[in-house]
Interface confidence: medium
Amino acid sequence: MAFSGSQAPYLSPAVPFSGTIQGGLQDGLQITVNGTVLSSSGTRFAVNFQTGFSGNDIAFHFNPRFEDGGYVVCNTRQNGSWGPEERKTHMPFQKGMPFDLCFLVQSSDFKVMVNGILFVQYFHRVPFHRVDTISVNGSVQLSYISFQNPRTVPVQPAFSTVPFSQPVCFPPRPRGRRQKPPGVWPANPAPITQTVIHTVQSAPGQMFSTPAIPPMMYPHPAYPMPFITTILGGLYPSKSILLSGTVLPSAQRFHINLCSGNHIAFHLNPRFDENAVVRNTQIDNSWGSEERSLPRKMPFVRGQSFSVWILCEAHCLKVAVDGQHLFEYYHRLRNLPTINRLEVGGDIQLTHVQT
């Protein structure tokens, strides 16, 4: 499981795909379909929320069509018969381009976001609790399908006594011009993926954004240290984590850990007392061999601000500091979705965390 209480994601499923939604649809459940529209074949794809695998009962049929200028059809099928179509004449997908498609189930409707932007609301025509299956077909390649139960993914600083039970909700529609997804690493351009921006306020909560929207900074007191939070859905190829902060003037060391259960899959440990950036993995309380090589001088400086950008790829983590590549760390724990906890501690003050 990627995180307790939520269904593990389907990773790189073949299309056509049909998979069970464990426990069926529930109010507040968010389902993310991440993939790429094929540029070569076909003019349509569809995501269906249905009862069983037959395709005769589809509560919500979401069907982008690259025809007649592009449009999206939404519909419901009952006992093999389609109802009236609802058409959206705007086409938010592009052939050959990655996408992040999020469905939020609410009591009255499905809210659909494409690449972080609210695209359409589809009001329920049949009771959504009958839905137990998601299917995807057509001209699309899938990276993953993930499930997020809002009651199981708190943003929880260490030692906090505040209960975290606010529902996760879609962000307000961003104002102004929407940016296109970033071309991040050339060999495998990162699709836009759901991001949590962690803020520490009187009632800590969470807000969703995407790497397509520049990181937003919110006024907040200093993050409690150590800082511990859940990584929604765990790691997967293209997942980005961004942290920024300031090194304390008298700093000796700090660490950023990506954890899986009791294991530390990735331990990033800048040491000012050794002028080194140590990387390692701890499995069952046993450390492996350290990695210390750097392509340039120690990028962390006492008293100075920094940002660390961690990109997960299939074989390794890529780490940049202040926008410049620092090293690659090849996965030693390879069950990426189980790496679902971020821990930060030591001689820094955190100003921003985005997972």
Epitope: Q179, K180, P181, P182, G183, V184, W185, P186, P211, A212, I213, P214, P215, L242, S244, S293, L294, P295, R296, K297, S305, F306, S307, W309, K318, A320, D322, G323, Q324, H325
Partner: antibody, heavy 117, light 107 residues
Framework: EVQLVESGGGLVQPGGSLRLSCAAS????????IHWVRQAPGKGLEWVAA????????YYADSVKGRFTISADTSKNTAYLQMNSLRAEDTAVYYC??????????WGQGTLVTVSS | DIQMTQSPSSLSASVGDRVTITCRAS??????VAWYQQKPGKAPKLLIY???SLYSGVPSRFSGSRSGTDFTLTISSLQPEDFATYYC?????????FGQGTKVEIK
């Protein structure tokens, strides 16, 4: 699609000033280093300055330090190069480039700056 | 500052030839070296990063290697579209520095 578009070049007298703009789109502007690189007529590439918008960290070549100022407006996804006390040897095509982690992966088309009396 | 000394400054070659361009760093830059191709009137294009990694979309006839502070760009079989000027660049730390360039001309 990642795009960088420079503007603001032109003819200026020695000692004069000019401000170049680099409008970026298609990526998360504040996460990448933005560089200015110039190329004098018939010469090679010379790195001029860079900024990391996320923290507004700036870097300069010795040849322009104290005369040029690099800045960025993350709300406009635009980087600027303010050039003061211009000299004849500053005549060049000025490119802005995105500092990909491993170098400069996207470049603008360039804008020509001519310093002459 | 780290200096990048590139050689040769120019070379003449024929289609199908194997071409090698070298760059020497004045001090250790680890593998933080990139190679670019530039054609007249155009912006440079990234070919190689991290000394030996091929940038997305670049033909596999281009390759890079490192030996200590010496860096090499190799074109295994020169094609008509490869006639251009090539630059190395180090990004170990600011100031970022380029080599002087190597112009590859038709023999």
């Amino acid at each position: 699609e990642v795009q960088l578009v420079e503007s603001g070049g032109g003819l200026v007298q020695p000692g004069g000033s000019l401000r170049l703009s680099c409008a970026a789109s298609g990526f998360t502007f504040s996460w990448y280093v933005i560089h200015w690189v110039r190329q004098a007529p018939g010469k090679g590439l010379e790195w001029v300055a860079a900024i990391y918008p996320y923290h507004s960290k700036t870097y300069y070549a010795d040849s322009v330090k104290g005369r040029f100022t690099i800045s960025a407006d993350t709300s406009k996804n635009t980087a600027y190069l303010q050039m003061n006390s211009l000299r004849a040897e500053d005549t060049a095509v000025y490119y802005c480039a995105r500092g990909y982690w491993y170098g400069m992966d996207y470049w603008g088309q360039g804008t020509l700056v001519t310093v002459s009396s | 500052d780290i200096q990048m000394t590139q050689s040769p400054s120019s070379l003449s070659a024929s289609v199908g030839d194997r071409v090698t361009i070298t760059c020497r760093a004045s001090q250790s830059v680890s593998s933080a070296v990139a190679w670019y191709q530039q054609k007249p009137g155009k912006a440079p294009k990234l070919l190689i990063y991290s000394a030996s990694s091929l940038y997305s979309g670049v033909p596999s006839r281009f390759s890079g290697s490192r030996s200590g502070t010496d860096f090499t760009l190799t074109i295994s079989s020169l094609q008509p579209e490869d006639f251009a000027t090539y630059y190395c660049q180090q990004y170990t730390d600011a100031p970022w520095t380029f080599g002087q360039g190597t112009k590859v001309e038709i023999k």
